[in-house]
Interface confidence: low
């Protein structure tokens, strides 16, 4: 079943998706599509990365996280009711039928008040639990996310770091996080 995320009309919606590169620089192609994940690829692609870059994106869809570290979470800017629905995050691991597929359900609620224009990016939705680690640099143990180089011993302070990453402060036990390699 899909994990559900919520946003109000006029806000930015945040749909989390993560993977852990096998080694620094070993990025895996990822696609985001509107609609549940099909057997192959993504339907109605809204954003795509390759082994080194975001190589396709459409208006209002972007990656605010640090995709170079495997944070391929999707932000949808200034959502409307029409943005409701299932979104597919597909991590295209090399090999036959190796892809990791995550269906995330976005529920858009009518705005309580008309939002004032602002440069601040207010993300709504929960941050997924971050359990995967990878090696980087001299004997560092990492967790993955838009924050660099957070040690597992620092998980207890993660809520403070999440504030800095502009994501919601509440941790959830669900979300799209996988380890590659």
């Amino acid at each position: 079943s899909e994990v559900e995320y919520r946003a109000e009309v006029g806000q930015n919606a945040y749909l989390p998706c993560f993977y852990t590169p096998a080694a620094p620089g070993n990025l895996v192609p990822v696609c985001w599509g509107k609609g549940a994940c099909p057997v192959f690829e993504c339907g109605n692609v809204v954003l795509r990365t390759d082994e080194r870059d975001v190589n396709y994106w459409t208006s209002r869809y972007w990656l605010n996280g640090d995709f170079r570290k495997g944070d391929v979470s999707l932000t949808i800017e200034n959502v409307t009711l029409a943005d409701s629905g299932i979104y597919c995050c597909r991590i295209q691991i090399p090999g036959i039928m190796n892809d990791e597929k995550f269906n995330l359900k976005l529920v858009i609620k009518p705005a309580k008040v008309t939002p004032a224009p602002t440069r601040q990016r207010d993300f709504t939705a929960a941050f997924p639990r971050m359990l995967t680690t990878r090696g980087h640099g001299p004997a560092e143990t990492q967790t993955l996310g838009s924050l660099p180089d957070i040690n597992l011993t620092q998980i207890s302070t993660l809520a403070n770091e999440l504030r800095d990453s502009r994501l919601a402060n509440d941790l959830r036990d669900s979300g799209a996080t996988i380890r590659i390699g």
């Epitope: 620094p24 620089g25 870059d53 972007w62 001299p138 180089d149």
Partner: antibody
Framework: QVQLQQSGPELVKPGASVKISCKAS???????????IHWVKQRPGQGLEWIGW????????KYNEKFKVKATLTADTSSSTADMQLSSLTSEDSAVYYC????????????WGTGTTVTVSS | DILLTQSPAILSVSPGERVSFSCRAS??????IHWFQQRTNGSPRLLIK???ESISGIPSRFSGSGSGTDFTLSINSVESEDIADYYC?????????FGGGTKLEIK
């Protein structure tokens, strides 16, 4: 030789905005190897403050919360230039601003720009 | 935010002496610390990455050590060209932060 050449000094009035630029040369701005451009502030006689980064290939940005309203980072891949606009300037914004390069997966600044001095005065 | 405290604010040494700069982090950051030199009216220059890793083109008299919260930059035989400000910087978590710097003076 990798270089980050910054625009010249700026004298601006309080309340105004200013845009400073950082032109990269000696490496591929948006090539196979991913490089981020960071911006750092240094007030006279003081230390260094990180403002934020931009990845020129996608325009993705990340800001220090303290500078989220003050600074806007953009990049023009056709000219291999990263820009930073500072708005609603006050005397507190008088500083030298540096751009710096960070290679993918390294998380340190291996090349620094020449610096741009911004003076806010009426 | 992670606070980096450098001490002392000013170091005064004679040429040829060994000198050490201290950088203390407000929480454990593994080895995610980097050292920069900034000469008067110049841009910062990377000296040491990840607490102890050397940088190509930097004289071998510069070295670094430490992990967790306490880090040290050392110059084993100071030369006059080393007169500068020295900064540590952490890349353990956003926002990146710098120490307040230590000024090296030659007696």
């Amino acid at each position: 030789q990798v270089q980050l050449q910054q625009s010249g000094p700026e004298l601006v009035k309080p309340g105004a905005s200013v845009k400073i630029s950082c032109k990269a040369s000696g490496y591929s701005f948006t090539g196979y190897y991913i490089h981020y451009i960071h911006w750092v502030k240094q007030r006279p006689g003081q230390g260094l403050e990180w403002i934020g980064w931009i990845y020129p290939g996608s325009g993705n940005t990340k800001y220090n919360e303290k500078f989220k309203v003050k600074a806007t980072l953009t990049a023009d891949t056709s000219s291999s230039t990263a820009d930073m606009q500072l708005s609603s300037l006050t005397s507190e914004d008088s500083a030298v601003y540096y751009c710096a390069r960070e290679a993918w997966g390294n998380w340190y600044f291996d090349v620094w720009g020449t610096g741009t001095t911004v003076t806010v005065s009426s | 935010d992670i606070l980096l405290t450098q001490s002392p604010a000013i170091l005064s040494v004679s040429p040829g002496e060994r000198v050490s700069f201290s950088c203390r982090a407000s929480q454990s950051i593994g080895t995610s610390i980097h050292w920069f030199q900034q000469r008067t009216n110049g841009s910062p220059r990377l000296l040491i990455k990840y607490a102890s890793e050397s940088i190509s083109g930097i004289p071998s008299r510069f070295s670094g050590s430490g992990s967790g919260t306490d880090f040290t930059l050392s110059i084993n035989s100071v030369e006059s060209e080393d007169i500068a400000d020295y900064y540590c910087q952490q890349s353990n978590s956003w926002p990146y932060t710098f120490g307040g710097g230590t000024k090296l003076e030659i007696k």
